[in-house]
């Protein structure tokens, strides 16, 4: 007798824990920017503070009839999903509601900005415990709304936003496209993307993960004990806001980067049927459904990484793509991907004191993506070593020469545009452990890190026969930090990480003219963090 | 995630001098005007003027006041609806779109964004 969505996101071991602490005296506060809400509903009564904040546009139409229960419907339901006594994820969490959406569910960017500023002011006037801000709304891409989210996130507030219900790329909407918010898409009881009429959940690289968002039972503003089911990415975002509230009530010092990494790491993987998404978005969309993670005390010491895709570079000859990690994260490797295979590789460079992952398009290419592997490595000291391209016929080698530094990733960047230069197999027999070996005419970049107990090893997998992709996975206990296609392969589309799997993609046309001896090799660098051990390279 | 998506950024064609006012001519606009790519979601007439990150509290007020004064000289009444201090420096203004060129030339202005709708999801 538990609604499907709660069963899905709260593993059995948490259900009993929840029964022991009914209304939690947690100091976490959730701010909900939405419609007005019915605070007297049994699900949320006594837990909700309805602030006097109200910044909404006039309702459309001369015949619009303002009916309280309809005006409160969206917000009341979401408040219930977050902290409802019976159908809530974080039962008993304090919630503050700000009215930024009118009775028709419409608001403005300016009203939302004023709402976010109100939260910041409240935080300054009366500092409290951890704050979570739920933004179950979306508009067109807004630079200022994204910037405001960034500023608020940098004060320690965790923002969770709906991906949007437009069956479109979430990067075209705000606040969904803000990198500092946790952006949530919606799935149904079968863990499939939610369809809403002719539209449905948004998708793409700006979505961090998915959560239940179809037929979600929650408080109905129709009466003080009523329930109703609603669907949308708002409901999905409310689940994640509830999960985050629970994580913070157990461990109030968790940062945004830690929360996001843990949400991703402990989510249910590979259950979503990616065919629902447009083909060009499938590789960019995370196949992750949120679940409540265990506490760090139960799972301490794990090396957590996530993959961050850049925006598409565009097709111009010198177009570059840039992928960035969050300020707290370490960029452990950088790779690139192009659907046409015409790319000039990837590299790591420092911009404004932050390491970023760059990828370069090639002449005639349709554009590239830069793919960053962003990790939480406590007390890490990372640096980039690069070697310019060697003369024709020679390989380039680069390794980590500082003491106790281990190789976490390799990048290759070709100075020449002639792709045929890279088609000849390079000899890898002289390869040393802990070394990046370049394709011919490639500049090679090695990402080298020192951190207490960090150890890494390389794992390769090659396929000689025709194959669109080659994969190699890190085994349990190890985390994928680097992923590359090794030299000697025919024209490749590039490489990227999907959770703990390194995927090397080969050009369709390249399969036909490849000799059987010329293997495509996916090379994964797998690392783990053992706080008691010294940094080391595992043979 | 931070690149501007399907988004309209317009560099307005600005005369180098307006009404022969020397202080205005001195500042060449580098600020940009932005608006929602979906026309139906736009709210023309309401604009968020975003100032450079280091702009001081007093300078925000001065910039808003300067815009009002310069608009008044041209016979326009503008209304400053809200001043942003705590998250970013800027202000929300209700004004004619005719004044965008003038506003973009104000000192400290980084960009101006036309207000637009957001929707419950």
């Amino acid at each position: 007798s538990i609604p499907w969505n709660l069963e899905r996101i709260i593993p059995a071991w948490h259900q009993t824990e929840e029964d022991r602490s009914p209304d939690g005296s947690s100091q976490v506060e959730v701010y909900l920017l939405d419609t007005s809400i019915q605070g007297a509903h049994r699900e949320i009564e006594g837990r909700v503070t309805i602030t006097d904040f109200n910044s909404v546009p006039e309702e459309d139409g001369t015949r619009f009839h303002r009916q309280a229960s309809k005006c409160d419907s969206h917000g009341t339901h979401l408040a219930g999903v977050v902290s409802g006594r019976d159908a809530g994820v974080a039962k008993g969490t304090s919630l503050h509601s700000l009215r930024v959406l009118n009775c028709q569910g419409k608001g403005t960017v300016s009203g939302t900005l004023i709402g976010l500023e109100f939260i910041r002011k409240s935080q300054l006037i009366q500092p409290s415990g951890p704050l979570v801000v739920l933004l179950p709304l979306a508009g067109g891409y807004s630079r200022i709304l994204n910037a405001a989210c960034r500023h608020l996130a940098r004060t320690g507030v965790v923002l969770v936003a709906a991906a949007g219900n437009f069956r479109d790329d979430a990067c075209l909407y705000s606040p969904a496209s803000a990198p500092e918010v946790i952006t949530v898409g919606a799935t149904n009881a079968q863990d499939q993307p939610v369809t809403l009429g002719t539209l449905g959940t948004n998708f793409g690289r700006c979505v961090d993960l998915f959560a239940p968002g179809k037929d979600i039972i929650g408080a109905s503003s129709d009466c003080s004990t009523c329930f109703m089911s609603q669907s949308g990415t708002s409901q999905a975002a409310a689940h994640v806001a509830g999960i985050v509230a629970r994580m913070l009530s157990r461990e109030p010092t968790l940062t945004l980067a830690e929360l996001r990494q843990r949400l991703i790491h402990f989510s249910t993987k590979d259950v979503i049927n990616m065919a629902w998404f447009p083909e060009d978005q499938q590789v960019l969309t995370p196949n992750l459904v949120a679940t409540l993670p265990p506490s760090t005390h139960e799972t301490g010491g794990q090396l957590l990484c996530r993959t961050v895709w850049s925006a598409h570079s565009g097709p111009t000859r010198t177009a570059t793509a840039t992928a960035r990690c969050a300020p707290e994260e370490e960029l452990l490797s950088c790779s690139s991907f192009s659907r046409s295979g015409r790319r000039r590789g990837d590299w790591i460079e420092a911009i404004g004191g932050q390491q970023v992952c760059k990828a370069l398009n090639a002449f005639g290419g349709e554009g590239v993506y830069a793919v960053a592997r962003c990790c939480l490595v406590p007390r890490a000291n990372c640096s980039i070593h690069n070697t310019p391209a060697a003369r024709a016929g020679l390989e380039t080698h680069v390794h980590c020469h500082q003491k106790d530094h281990v190789l976490t990733g390799c990048s290759f960047h070709w100075e020449v545009e002639d792709l045929s230069v890279r088609r000849q197999p390079a000899l890898r027999s002289r390869r040393q452990p802990g070394q990046c070996v370049g394709h011919q005419a490639a500049s090679v970049y090695a990402s080298c890190c020192h951190a207490p107990g960090l150890e890494c090893k390389i794992k390769e997998h090659g396929i000689s026969g025709p194959s669109e992709q080659v994969t190699v996975a890190c085994e349990a206990g190890w985390t994928l930090t680097g992923c590359n296609v090794l030299p000697g392969a025919s024209l490749t589309l590039g490489a990227y990480s999907v959770d703990n799997l390194c995927v090397a993609r080969v050009h369709d046309t390249a399969r036909a003219d490849r000799t059987s001896g010329e293997a495509t090799v996916a090379a994964a660098i797998c690392c783990r963090s053992r706080p008691s051990a010294k940094a080391s390279w595992v043979q | 995630q931070d690149e501007d998506g399907d988004y309209e950024e317009l560099m307005l064609a600005l005369p180098s001098q307006e009404d022969g006012l020397a202080d205005e001519a001195a500042h060449v606009a580098t600020a940009t005007f932005r608006r929602c790519s979906k026309e139906a979601w736009r709210l023309p007439g309401t604009y968020i003027v975003v100032l450079m990150e280091e702009t001081q509290r007093l300078q925000i007020e001065q910039t808003a006041h300067r815009l009002q004064t310069r608009a008044a000289r041209r016979g326009y009444v503008i209304k400053v609806l809200h001043i942003f201090y705590d998250l970013f420096p800027g202000f929300l203004v209700k004004m004619s779109s005719d004044l965008l060129g003038l506003a973009l030339k104000l000192p400290h202005v980084e960009y101006i964004e036309e207000d637009s709708f957001v929707f419950a999801q």
């Epitope: 007798s1 538990i2 609604p3 007297a40 009523c226 | -």
Partner: antibody
Framework: QLQLQESGPGLVKPSETLSLTCTVS??????????WGWIRQPPGKGLEWIGS???????YYNPSLKSRVTISVDTSKNQFSLKLSSVTAADTAVYYC??????????????????WGQGTLVTVSS | EIVLTQSPATLSLSPGERATLSCRAS??????LAWYQQKPGQAPRLLIY???NRATGIPARFSGSGSGTDFTLTISSLEPEDFAVYYC????????FGGGTKVEIK
Amino acid sequence: QLQLQESGPGLVKPSETLSLTCTVSGGSIRSSAYYWGWIRQPPGKGLEWIGSINYRGSTYYNPSLKSRVTISVDTSKNQFSLKLSSVTAADTAVYYCARENSGVVPAAGPNWFGPWGQGTLVTVSS
Amino acid sequence: EIVLTQSPATLSLSPGERATLSCRASQSVSSYLAWYQQKPGQAPRLLIYDASNRATGIPARFSGSGSGTDFTLTISSLEPEDFAVYYCQQRRNWFTFGGGTKVEIK
């Protein structure tokens, strides 16, 4: 078949605390599909809802009685209890316990009261 | 709070007759209204919920109608066991009961 049975003293002195317990048999109290409520009926008068609780201990009370009411639950004994402090003669009534469908699990049925206990008369008198 | 006023206070009818009981709310309760039957020395029993839905095991002679502020419980043909007190109850805003209508044998 689910049955509810009220128990507790039939006589309470003014200004003291009225304490009653409801024992649930024929089913478990541990379900998010239900709340467990107290309703009273002064002699010859109408019914008044006092408050309700779920198995996790989440309570909600009649606003007019809130300051004096405490409802608690003991899932190990399949019981829930009512305490009403600072009683006066106006609190003399038949006290009923009843199951209330929470509405969270639609299959559990409508969000109303039933079944009820048979009621116990509590007289407030010195 | 929402006040429910029941009328008449007493209804004197003979078996086989039609009984019409009224319940008026001080503000709209939408359709969130129920009817209970209480016999002397017994607990109330749910008859109708959400204004017009019959509870399990309730005979078809009982029907409910209305929405907003005005509601009616109709007993199409009174049986001897139907003589009792009837209460309406709303759940639009917490729970309140009406004062009751006593249906007695004429």
